[in-house]
Amino acid sequence: YTSTAQPCPYPMAPPNGHVSPVQAKYILKDSFSIFCETGYELLQGHLPLKSFTAVCQKDGSWDRPMPACSIVDCGPPDDLPSGRVEYITGPGVTTYKAVIQYSCEETFYTMKVNDGKYVCEADGFWTSSKGEKSLPVCEPVCGLSARTTGGRIYGGQKAKPGDFPWQVLILGGTTAAGALLYDNWVLTAAHAVYEQKHDASALDIRMGTLKRLSPHYTQAWSEAVFIHEGYTHDAGFDNDIALIKLNNKVVINSNITPICLPRKEAESFMRTDDIGTASGWGLTQRGFLARNLMYVDIPIVDHQKCTAAYEKPPYPRGSVTANMLCAGLESGGKDSCRGDSGGALVFLDSETERWFVGGIVSWGSMNCGEAGQYGVYTKVINYIPWIENIISDF
């Protein structure tokens, strides 16, 4: 008595798949595998399979049911902070070879990393034309102001909405200022926040307002304070620079916009007699803190001239260092003052038509706007590597 094993039914490949090996017939212990076309993956029911092989059994049946080759689906793309995603292939289409387009909110944000076009690839990931799987980044546009150029604090005039959208009011012990960088950092003077370096949460940070006492402002809180390691409190003002990391990103609009950091070419806009603009709520000629944000246009002063002005008592020799720049009128009358500390001295880059921070309000003579004395500012261009390192590390 002999029995022959039944051959198994000829395996019909699922749509978008193929059988291997192809044989005339499949008998006991013969097997076949299913391979899907690029952009399709094996599915048994709803479960994805890494591979599929079926074996012909003695009774002439396959030991596993035929799987399906289903088109790869990258799923709904991640939301882009301060941007949007658009479906290009068709509404909600997220399957293999579908195209989506990320874009940033107009006017106030610009796209970094790539062009924002992503394709659903066979691996199931949205991938940019450069091969990146990560989202693009919407970076705030910096240096936008309602003010186009400097016109004619101390000896200053009232700011209008949108003139200094990077202006930050810092409360916590004393009144100080800062300038918004990107959407979650504030650039300020080390001496203005030194007391809070270990208690960042004590800083009350306000922006998007002109009136110092207004209840209408955007509140921000500090996550950490980074003071330049070269700054020594109560021993001069060299390296008088600090960064505050905000615990949340702020929403950028016409009243809240970051200031640009200086480009390598920025020094060409900050030569002697070039006009910079300082803004703040510091002391005015009347001797009181300003209620409304004030600004003053002041020329850069020759470095040697400034050094000489602060060589005589009561100032110790070497008060003005290479990390500082000076601005003001020889005749006096226009200056930043106490309460303006940490604020930005800004310049217009005529090539990019964006404002950038050239200086940080640091120190000056006891009497603001005094003839023959000048306001002294931290020279920001000297600290670009320090700023970039802190921001990239944290």
Partner: antibody, heavy 116, light 111 residues
């Protein structure tokens, strides 16, 4: 409260034009693709047109292609449907609906009647 | 275009019983991750209301009496137990490709 309110419907002569509007509120309009869907009297639902969140892509049903134009004004939170060369078979209740992957929010609709 | 065939066209179900509505697509609307089939309820004089998205996901605020199942080309909407308020027309709709199309509708009546 998320809301869509259509307007602009009415009686139109065959061959005439009409512009429908859909005012959105209660959500970030500029983040969503939007559609127009219509329903002829005592009939089923028919998808008409889609526009992506930033107006980069548009899609139309074959029955309206070349005659209808979908557009949007994100700052004003408004969706539009410009209808031209209207026919009697365009008579329907027109709904605007939100969503890129499904119609998750609908307006109450506005009626367009094409008749001489 | 993908054609969706709904059955039955009308249905009368006793209060508390189960209502089952079927929808067949002329081609598969299922990918490796999702089925692009959705179910709507429409009451007279009202716009449609999303009940189930992606074949089986209940939209928020929709009672758990409603459930959906299926993949590929065959999908089902179940309502159990049926309530008086469920009197309406039910539509399936796909979003696999343009044009998005709807089934012809199923009119549910409660006995």
């Amino acid at each position: 409260d998320v809301q869509l309110v259509e307007s602009g419907g009415g009686l139109v002569q065959p061959g005439g034009s009409r512009k429908l509007s859909c005012a959105a509120s209660g959500f970030t309009f500029s983040s969503f693709g939007m559609h127009w869907v219509r329903q002829a009297p005592e009939k089923g639902l028919e998808w008409v047109a889609y526009i992506s969140s930033g107006s980069s892509s548009f899609f139309y049903a074959d029955t309206v292609k070349g005659r209808f134009t979908i557009s949007r004004d994100n700052p004003k939170n408004t969706l539009f449907l410009q209808m031209t060369s209207l026919r009697s078979e365009d008579t329907a209740m027109y709904y605007c609906a939100r969503g890129d992957r499904n119609f998750d929010v609908w307006g109450a609709g506005t009626t367009v009647t094409v008749s001489s | 275009d993908i054609v969706l065939t709904q059955s039955p066209a009308s249905l009368a179900v006793s209060l508390g019983q189960r209502a089952t509505i079927s929808c067949r697509a002329s081609q598969s609307v299922t990918s490796s991750r999702y089925s692009y089939m959705h179910w709507f309820q429409q009451k007279p004089g009202q716009p449609p209301n999303l009940l189930i998205k992606h074949a089986s996901n209940l939209e928020s605020g929709v009672p758990a009496r409603f459930s959906g199942s299926g993949s590929g080309t065959d999908f089902t909407l179940n309502i159990h137990p049926v309530e008086e308020d469920d009197t309406a027309t039910y539509y399936c709709q796909h979003s696999w490709e343009v044009p998005w199309t709807f089934g012809g509708g199923t009119k549910l009546e409660i006995k």
